[in-house]
């Protein structure tokens, strides 16, 4: 057993038909001695008197607030949660695994930049009583500044029959260096409470390798005299890390037409035109990657030909 | 990724060519070795990151852009030392700290090119022959150096008596690689800086 | 004490269905992960499908995928195996299982698909 | 599919020790832990082992587990008669848990 927070405990339990559970000792916290009585959640059936309850903790209804009282009048509370282990493993019932970049990823980050700064979030199909809190470090031995936000629903979506819950959260790295050489991960910890089910989930991660730049802005297309051609031409994200000769991007440039089965045209450069033959109907689009270290393609931006 | 790469221009900042050659051939090693190399923990998630480097040579502080000097969590240690400069440095205006940079970015190289000849060296007499360095990347390390043509004492090549461990070699490799690579990357991103100058 | 009682094997042809149940005693079933695990005869065990505690995730072998489906019926305390479109390699003793560090099996029963 | 390659067959006298390995790779022993279930003829599998060393109650103290990186064994000091089964190492792959992933078998066979 161990303490989340102030009065809040975490039960850890080896989770399968038949164990023998935990025996956990509550100390109710008051100078009293005598006349202490003991009772769970709203029930008022004593469970004990004293100013320790030894219980048997094996099931989810042996979990949750314990308060000692003394003539009605309660002296204090222990929330009791459970952290289930299976067969070694502990559990992940709380969240989806989002399956990508492989299995078992249960919470994905993504930086627009080198500043320091990254977004995580992670799925779930819960509603209701449920809470997140978010601790990041830099390294784990001996852990650096990361300041997280707090975590906040951040779209909702309908998958099947099932309704699908987006949370995310900023943290910014206390000093960054962008042009540094990282030598320590960054260490995300989320702490995921639903009702009486603890559960934690971590993700270990280079910030150069989920950078993900913004797509390239201010896309404008020039014809070209006497010529099917177009000079296709773009800017830096807003976003991205300055100066743009030391952290350079290269870029992908397509011209889709509209159906989805024709061939697409696909340019590569490094610089911000491109001249491309514009067809009838098609768009043209371009997306953004670090020049030097392949991590994500930002998202199209795109124009329409005509 | 391989895609379609723009030959540099004569008049282009000498070292730019080389150091963008620097990186896809590091790049491809690594990405050999992955492969090679999958029994092996050889991935970034497994590695422990460590930088041969590291007290000898401060290339990320000495090549800091211009840009970035104000943000004081770039300029925690900033010791280097001056050597005087090379062929790289096209013109007269080149600052001290320029010619310290390209200094910095020589002695990072040559470091490199004994731990990885002394490695080629051991992986050459392991029964498996299972992964060798690649000599294009090698001649690319010397083709920079040249280019950047700084005067400094040859470092000789590490010899070791004792037999070697190539499970821990291979390992060795793998942290070798996964470092020049992201050294290669600084050293790409400061030529690309450069030439802009 | 837990018990799990299976039923619902017998010989059956390629190409049909067949559906096996395991019943479960003695702990509460809602709150756990099943499997179902299978041995040909004379070969190893080969692991085919699990279930989580409240149904909401499913887990298939390869072998099995899109042909066996895993489900659990909380109220009465069973879990299933709808097996389809079975083949001959499908013949073995299938054995239901719950999840954890110490685990308990059903008795096993024994499917046989042949013409 | 095996991932977890067990020898097919060991065998001892009474009295002896006998040893079975469990080999695999990084992503599955590697990373997880390690079950070994003996199985007697026409009986469904017996846990002797969890948690790579730790013996259920009811387990006579003469099997012991062990793990070692990407690898694990199960060892029979004072082989009885009434041991001779079959035995199967279990883990898990990280990337694909909670799919069990069994160990090919080993059947032990005590002689005289």
């Known amino acids: 057993i161990w303490e989340l927070k102030k009065d809040v405990y975490v039960v850890e339990l080896d989770w399968y038909p038949d164990a023998p559970g935990e025996m956990v000792v509550l100390t109710c916290d008051t100078p009293e001695e005598d006349g202490i009585t003991w009772t769970l959640d709203q029930s008022s059936e004593v469970l004990g008197s004293g100013k320790t309850l030894t219980i048997q903790v094996k099931e989810f209804g042996d979990a949750g607030q314990y308060t000692c009282h003394k003539g009605g009048e309660v002296l204090s509370h222990s929330l009791l949660l459970l952290h289930k282990k299976e067969d070694g493993i502990w559990s992940t019932d709380i969240l989806k695994d989002q399956k990508e970049p492989k299995n078992k990823t249960f919470l994905r980050c993504e930086a627009k930049n080198y500043s320091g700064r990254f977004t995580c979030w992670w799925l779930t199909t819960i509603s209701t009583d449920l809470t997140f809190s978010v601790k990041s470090s830099r390294g784990s031995s001996d852990p650096q500044g990361v300041t997280c936000g707090a975590a906040t629903l951040s779209a909702e979506r309908v998958r099947g029959d099932n309704k699908e819950y987006e949370y995310s959260v900023e943290c910014q790295e206390d000093s960054a260096c962008p042009a540094a050489e990282e030598s320590l991960p960054i260490e995300v910890m989320v702490d995921a409470v639903h009702k009486l089910k603890y559960e934690n989930y971590t993700s270990s991660f280079f910030i150069r390798d989920i950078i993900k730049p913004d797509p390239p802005k201010n896309l404008q297309l020039k014809p070209l005299k006497n010529s099917r051609q177009v000079e296709v031409s773009w800017e830096y994200p807003d976003t991205w890390s300055t100066p743009h000769s030391y952290f350079s991007l290269t870029f992908c440039v397509q011209v889709q037409g509209k159906s989805k089965r024709e061939k697409k045209d696909r340019v590569f450069t490094d610089k911000t035109s491109a001249t491309v033959i514009c067809r009838k109907n098609a768009s043209i689009s371009v997306r953004a990657q670090d020049r030097y270290y392949s991590s994500s393609w930002s998202e199209w931006a795109s124009v329409p030909c005509s | 990724r391989n895609l379609p790469v723009a030959t540099p221009d004569p008049g282009m900042f000498p070292c730019l060519h080389h150091s963008q050659n620097l990186l896809r051939a590091v790049s491809n090693m690594l990405q050999k070795a992955r492969q090679t190399l999958e029994f092996y923990p050889c991935t970034s998630e497994e590695i422990d990151h460590e930088d041969i480097t590291k007290d000898k040579t401060s290339t990320v502080e000495a090549c800091l852009p211009l840009e970035l000097t104000k943000n004081e969590s770039c300029l925690n240690s900033r010791e280097t030392s001056f050597i005087t400069n090379g062929s790289c440095l096209a013109s007269r205006k080149t600052s001290f700290m320029m010619a310290l940079c390209l200094s910095s970015i020589y002695e990072d190289l040559k470091m490199y090119q004994v731990e990885f000849k002394t490695m080629n060296a051991k992986l050459l007499m392991d029964p498996k022959r299972q992964i060798f360095l690649d000599q294009n990347m090698l001649a690319v390390i010397d083709e920079l150096m040249q280019a950047l043509n700084f005067n400094s004492e040859t470092v000789p090549q590490k010899s070791s008596l004792e037999e070697p461990d190539f499970y821990k070699t291979k390992i060795k490799l793998c942290i070798l690689l996964h470092a020049f690579r992201i050294r290669a990357v600084t050293i790409d991103r400061v030529m690309s800086y450069l030439n802009a100058s | 004490q837990v018990q799990l009682v299976q039923s619902g094997g017998g010989v059956v042809q390629p190409g049909r269905s067949l559906r096996l149940s395991c019943a479960a005693s003695g702990f509460t079933f809602s709150s756990y992960g099943m499997h179902w695990v299978r041995q040909a005869p004379g070969k190893g065990l080969e692991w085919v499908a699990f279930?989580?505690?409240?149904?909401?995730?499913?887990y298939y072998a390869d072998s099995v995928k899109g042909r066996f489906t895993i489900s659990r019926d909380n109220s009465k305390n069973t879990l299933y195996l709808q097996m389809k479109s079975l083949r001959a390699e499908d013949t073995a003793v299938y054995y239901c299982?719950?999840?954890?560090?110490?685990?308990?099996w059903g008795q096993g029963t024994m499917v046989t698909v042949s013409s | 599919s095996y991932v977890l390659t067990q020898p097919p067959s060991v065998s001892g006298t009474p009295g002896q020790r006998v040893t079975i390995s469990c080999s695999g790779g990084?992503?599955?022993?590697?990373?997880?832990?390690v079950k070994w279930y003996q199985q007697l003829p026409g009986t469904a599998p017996k846990l002797l082992i969890y948690?790579?060393?730790r013996r259920p109650s009811g387990v006579p103290d003469r099997f012991s587990g062990s793990k070692s990186g990407t690898s694990a064994s199960l060892a029979i000091t004072g082989v009885q008669a009434e041991d001779e089964a079959d035995y199967y190492c279990?883990?898990?792959?990280?990337?694909?848990?909670?799919?069990?992933?069994f160990g090919t078998g080993t059947k032990v066979t005590v002689l005289g």
């Open positions: 299982k719950t999840h954890g560090s110490h685990d308990n």
């Open positions: 990084r992503s599955n022993i590697g990373s997880n832990t």
């Open positions: 279930i989580r505690y409240d149904g909401s995730n499913k």
């Open positions: 948690g790579n060393d």
């Open positions: 279990q883990s898990y792959d990280r990337g694909t848990h909670p799919a069990l992933l």
